[in-house]
């Protein structure tokens, strides 16, 4: 039998996405990052 349609079975937990930019000095430009749930991932 074919399966009926359902979701993936894995819950999606909403987390706050925070983009930030930090000035690290005139000759190094800026670091741009993405923080997900308190962890910097980019």
């Amino acid at each position: 039998d074919a399966e009926f349609r359902h979701d993936s079975g894995y819950e999606v937990h909403h987390q706050k996405l925070v983009f930030f930019a930090e000035d690290v000095g005139s000759n190094k430009g800026a670091i741009i990052g993405l923080m997900v749930g308190g962890v910097v991932i980019a």
Epitope: D1, A2, E3, F4, R5, H6, D7, S8, G9, Y10, E11, V12, H14
Partner: antibody, heavy 124, light 112 residues
Framework: QVTLKESGPGILKPSQTLSLTCSFS??????????VGWIRQPSGKGLEWLAH???????YYNPSLKSQLTISKDTSRNQVFLKITSVDTADTATYYC????????????????WGQGTTLTVSL | DVLMTQTPLSLPVSLGDQASISCRSS???????????LEWYLQKPGQSPKLLIY???NRFSGVPDRFSGSGSGTDFTLKISRVEAEDLGVYYC?????????FGAGTKLELK
């Protein structure tokens, strides 16, 4: 609050086409994950699932009746339709529509709201 | 098709009794996503079915805790710990994993 209400012809003759309408309120079929299905019940007997339609127009049918069934929707009017061609006396039943959605965050994957049902009699 | 076999078909009880209804599926109803879409519905005379239990053992909102569901794979059970008058009616098990979706034949819970 969520409500669903079925409507139909009441009486048909064998070989005619049954057209049913499910009019609902309290939710929208434009919402991702939302779906509406049809279930029927001959008087004094058990329940038989017929078809289901999803917000994205994906459709599922009972294979034993698939050649006779067509499910469709009018999202803007909050209505779902079921057509059954070439009805017979065996199609005499109460027809229910019910909401069933798929949602990864909130566990709504069940028939949580049902209409009151509309009765069809197929008779010569 | 997945055949859902309910036993017993009729269950005479006295108020306050414990009641147990069995449902057996003809094949596994574990979906590929890992969930088992086994539900229990109660239909009272002249009314549409009402959801009691979903995914084997989860009580739907507003359902009293005297109702409990259990089981896995192909064997499932609905238990009512102390039957009340409002519990009388026909109970249907249902599988939503495979097409066609199928119901059991129903178990009529009635007074002795």
């Amino acid at each position: 609050q969520v409500t669903l209400k079925e409507s139909g012809p009441g009486i048909l003759k064998p070989s005619q086409t049954l057209s049913l309408t499910c009019s609902f309120s309290g939710f929208s079929l434009s919402t991702s994950g939302m779906g509406v299905g049809w279930i029927r019940q001959p008087s004094g007997k058990g329940l038989e699932w017929l078809a289901h339609i999803w917000w994205d127009d994906d459709k599922y049918y009972n294979p034993s009746l698939k050649s006779q069934l067509t499910i469709s929707k009018d999202t803007s009017r909050n209505q779902v339709f079921l057509k059954i061609t070439s009805v017979d006396t065996a199609d005499t039943a109460t027809y229910y529509c019910a909401r069933r959605s798929i949602n990864s965050v909130v566990p709504e994957d069940y028939f949580d709201y049902w209409g009151q049902g509309t009765t069809l009699t197929v008779s010569l | 098709d997945v055949l859902m076999t309910q036993t017993p078909l009729s269950l005479p009880v006295s108020l306050g009794d414990q009641a147990s209804i069995s449902c057996r599926s003809s094949q596994s109803i574990v979906h590929s996503n890992g969930n088992t879409y086994l539900e229990w519905y109660l239909q009272k005379p002249g009314q549409s079915p009402k959801l009691l239990i979903y995914k084997v053992s989860n009580r739907f909102s507003g359902v009293p805790d005297r109702f409990s569901g259990s089981g896995s794979g192909t064997d499932f059970t609905l238990k009512i710990s102390r039957v009340e008058a409002e519990d009388l009616g026909v109970y249907y098990c249902f599988q939503g994993s495979h097409v066609p979706l199928t119901f059991g034949a129903g178990t009529k819970l009635e007074l002795k």
